[in-house]
Interface confidence: low
Amino acid sequence: DAHKSEVAHRFKDLGEENFKALVLIAFAQYLQQCPFEDHVKLVNEVTEFAKTCVADESAENCDKSLHTLFGDKLCTVATLRETYGEMADCCAKQEPERNECFLQHKDDNPNLPRLVRPEVDVMCTAFHDNEETFLKKYLYEIARRHPYFYAPELLFFAKRYKAAFTECCQAADKAACLLPKLDELRDEGKASSAKQRLKCASLQKFGERAFKAWAVARLSQRFPKAEFAEVSKLVTDLTKVHTECCHGDLLECADDRADLAKYICENQDSISSKLKECCEKPLLEKSHCIAEVENDEMPADLPSLAADFVESKDVCKNYAEAKDVFLGMFLYEYARRHPDYSVVLLLRLAKTYETTLEKCCAAADPHECYAKVFDEFKPLVEEPQNLIKQNCELFEQLGEYKFQNALLVRYTKKVPQVSTPTLVEVSRNLGKVGSKCCKHPEAKRMPCAEDYLSVVLNQLCVLHEKTPVSDRVTKCCTESLVNRRPCFSALEVDETYVPKEFNAETFTFHADICTLSEKERQIKKQTALVELVKHKPKATKEQLKAVMDDFAAFVEKCCKADDKETCFAEEGKKLVAASQAALGL
């Protein structure tokens, strides 16, 4: 339904509070370096304009598109060229090219200072002094650091953030109440950001069809009692929501997400028996709850898949008549029967089925050709099962830190050209799969592990895309979305890599390491480990373990010494010499 004024339509649908919050998120995700005060000024100007349009939809400029209105507003920023360089050239373009240009300049790794958490009393005072500014600042700081964060979900995080301060700032022990809540929000926020980044990469790099296939598989696992037509409708609506959010259309995205939650709750009887609690919650909580809802029970009487997809004489006829619908039905039927498979595995099976039909439906005897197609699935299923089994055993044997180190070595040998900070960050996150998924029973391990690994490897892909240094990473990231993990798993040591020259400075440590937190100290040691492997890619596990054990002992010894700096200088030289000897550097 067409509206005379799009901005008035969204303002009325969302309400002033959500409108302002979403415009702030949108602006902060586009202009990530702009000061908070500048963004607030822009948002207030847009909001005042929107109110004039609500009062009179025929008023001047009210008929303009949101991209035009927002883009014009962003292009008024005086320091655009000084702060953003060539991004300023976007302002010379017309819509829709201007918005595409802004999107292309979003930075997944902006050069922003690490957020230091203020003291609890300081935060509570700031919260009480000006609650609105305090919460806006939270939205701004998260949005500029995570330019693809799912905007309606960020509103939900902000609501929880506000609730935490409201409760804890009047508690007897403010810190004991608040800090665990903030830690939880931080960790959940990072995970939410990474999951959404994969959705946007899927849409932007592999297209709508790839995203829809992912959504069919996931929703069919979650709602196995729903009819195919119902799942298809949900997939279409969900694709629209995420396309809008990934495209910077945050007002439309939030509005459509609310409509989708309303539809799901009105039709829960034909979707899932698990939605009742979610649907009793307020809007933001409801949408979040639906997105995280557990899988419904599988219908008891599901027939064998083979009848419709292998044994039927009409397989090629049905495929030829509507390829994507038939493949969608295959994916739906397979996924609803297999909550124990990862979504990416289900997509690999569907791709294998599609390739087989493409080949066989053109053969002399199609049925004979595709009769054994399900046999081709066996190795595809066993590969992630075996990999998860092996890695969970290794995790249980080593614990998280040493498991991360094993992955650091593995991935540095595979792609040594990648920057050390990226290798450390990605390998640490890959290593978290152990504590996240290995505790689950067999039936839940694969969907937990492989779909989580897809999210983490996407982080590697988007960071690498900014500064490409490895053809192997580019190849694994771009060839197939669903085969990224198997592609990285299959990489062996890069024999073409010329080892980094040894630089003693890289392995020179100072007494400041003693004042770091345990996590930061681990990162320092893991950084050194990556550098060691880059110097000596052929070093054995045993050699590296010996050097790392010596290193840990060296840090412990010098941190206990009276004259720490001297200890680090003198013992450090000995350690470097011993390491060079041990590794043959």
Epitope: V116, R117, P118, E119, V120, V122, H510, A511, D512, C514, T515, L516, S517, C559, K564
Partner: nanobody, 117 residues
Framework: EVQLLESGGGLVQPGGSLRLSCAAS????????MSWVRQAPGKGPERVSA????????IYADSVKGRFTISRDNSKNTLYLQMNSLRPEDTAVYYC??????????PGQGTLVTVSS
């Protein structure tokens, strides 16, 4: 917002003493290691001393060892630097920083220490 306000500097004769203070706010002071850094005119910043979050670990540059003492009072969110046996070469702007950074962590201007007869 992080605030670090240094005080206690001034003009002192060689061999004299001064005690610098750094009042911290806007972050959980007790969870961070802290440093004193100085910058002499025309020179780069030099870390003078650092202290762990609980005060148990300390570090000193060779040039100040035995003369300067770093300490902290987490209940007051304050970092201290006791400077004895001052020398002309200790003349510099002194500022405190979070962690082991040698760049200012907050808007504080530092405090000027001048050692001259």
């Amino acid at each position: 917002e992080v605030q670090l306000l240094e005080s206690g500097g001034g003009l002192v004769q060689p061999g004299g003493s001064l005690r610098l203070s750094c009042a911290a706010s806007g972050f959980t002071f007790s969870q961070f290691g802290m440093s004193w850094v100085r910058q002499a005119p025309g020179k780069g910043p030099e870390r003078v001393s650092a202290i762990s979050s609980d005060g148990s670990g300390t570090i000193y540059a060779d040039s100040v060892k035995g003369r300067f003492t770093i300490s902290r009072d987490n209940s007051k969110n304050t970092l201290y630097l006791q400077m004895n046996s001052l020398r002309p070469e200790d003349t510099a702007v002194y500022y405190c920083t979070i962690g082991s950074s040698t760049t200012p962590s907050g808007p504080g201007q530092g405090t000027l220490v001048t050692v001259s007869s």
